[in-house]
C-alpha cells in the first residue's frame, strides 16, 4: 500500500488543480472503507496500481485518498423540493497524478495516471444513501455505482431506487 507518509507528501495547493477551467471547491484527505469496515487499499504491482478491499491488521495504517469536490456546471434535472444547490461530483486520488476511473466496458474501477483536464470517467456523483455512508455514481453511466465484488472494486448497476441502499455500494469516509 502507498501508506500515509506517501500521501502526506502529496499536499497540492488548494486551488492548484483545474478541470476544463473548473477548480475543485473543496479538497481533503480521507480513508475509504466499506459498509462492513473493510479498507480500500492501493498497491503498486508490475508498474501498475491495484485496488484491494481487505481487512487491515490492528495497527496497520489506512491508505488515504484526496477527495476533490466539484460543482456541476449543469443544473440538476431532478424534481424535488426546490433545491437550489449545485450537484457535487468528486474525484478520488490516492497518489499524485493517479485517479480512480470507471471502466464501463469492463465494469471495473481502475487507477489511471492522467493529466488535466481529467476525463469524465474520473468523476463520480456523490450520494448520501445511508447514515454516515456515501456512494459514488459514474458521471459517464448514470445508475452505475462503485461497489465491492470479490474483494475488489467494481462497477455495479443499480436498477431501482430500492436498491440504492444495498451494502456493497456504501462507503465510509474517515479522516483519522
Amino acid at each position: 500500500a502507498f501508506g500515509i507518509s506517501g500521501v502526506q507528501k502529496y499536499t497540492r495547493a488548494l486551488h492548484d488543480s483545474s478541470i476544463t477551467g473548473i477548480s475543485p471547491i473543496t479538497e481533503y484527505l480521507a480513508s475509504l472503507s466499506t459498509y462492513n469496515d473493510q479498507s480500500i487499499t492501493f498497491a503498486l504491482e508490475d508498474e501498475s496500481y491495484e485496488i484491494y478491499v481487505e481487512d487491515l491488521k490492528k495497527d496497520e495504517k489506512k491508505d488515504k485518498v484526496l477527495l476533490s469536490y466539484y460543482e456541476s456546471q449543469h443544473p440538476s434535472n431532478e424534481s424535488g423540493d426546490g433545491v437550489d444547490g449545485k450537484m457535487l461530483m468528486v474525484t478520488l486520488s490516492p497518489t499524485k497524478d493517479f485517479w480512480l476511473h470507471a471502466n464501463n466496458k469492463e465494469h471495473s474501477v481502475e487507477l489511471h495516471k492522467c493529466e488535466k483536464p481529467l476525463p469524465d470517467q474520473a468523476f463520480f456523483v456523490l450520494h448520501n444513501m445511508h447514515s454516515n455512508c456515501v456512494s459514488f455514481e459514474c458521471k459517464t453511466d448514470p445508475g452505475v455505482f462503485i461497489g465491492v465484488k470479490d474483494n475488489h472494486l467494481a462497477l455495479i448497476k443499480v436498477d431501482s431506487s430500492e436498491n440504492l441502499c444495498t451494502e456493497n455500494i456504501l462507503f465510509k469516509l474517515s479522516e483519522t
Partner: nanobody, 121 residues
C-alpha cells in the same frame, strides 16, 4: 431547500480577532462538510477552511496557525475563529456546505450570501 446564514463579520484592526458563524437550515438529511471561502475585491473566490462530518479539517496555507474552524453538529453550524488578522484577509467570507436533502440522495453544494470582513487601521 437549504439556507445558510452567516454572521460575525465587521471591521477590525490588524492583529485583531473575529468569529464568524454559519447556520444551515431547511430540509437537511445529511451534511458532508461545511466550510468557508472568501473573495477579495478583484480576486477569485478561494477556499479558507473546511470541516467534514467526521471532524477532519483543511486550511489554506495563508491562514494556517491563525484561523480555526469548528462545528456544532447538533445545530448544523460551523464557526471560523480568525486571529492575528491582516489587511490581506479583507474579503467577503462565504459559507459553503455539501448536503443532501430529504427529497434526493444526491449531495449538493449550497452557499450563503456572505459576510464582509474588513481589516484596517
Amino acid at each position: 431547500q437549504v439556507q445558510l446564514v452567516e454572521s460575525g463579520g465587521g471591521l477590525v484592526q490588524p492583529g485583531g480577532s473575529l468569529r464568524l458563524s454559519c447556520a444551515a437550515s431547511g430540509s437537511i438529511r445529511t451534511v458532508n462538510y461545511m466550510g468557508w471561502h472568501r473573495q477579495a475585491p478583484g480576486k477569485q473566490r478561494e477556499l479558507v477552511s473546511v470541516v467534514t462530518s467526521g471532524g477532519g479539517t483543511n486550511y489554506a496555507d495563508s491562514v494556517k496557525g491563525r484561523f480555526t474552524i469548528s462545528r456544532d453538529d447538533t445545530k448544523n453550524t460551523v464557526y471560523l475563529q480568525m486571529n492575528s488578522l491582516r489587511a490581506e484577509d479583507t474579503a467577503v467570507y462565504y459559507c459553503n456546505a455539501a448536503a443532501s436533502t430529504y427529497s434526493s440522495t444526491v449531495v449538493r453544494s449550497f452557499w450563503g450570501q456572505g459576510t464582509l470582513v474588513t481589516v484596517s487601521s
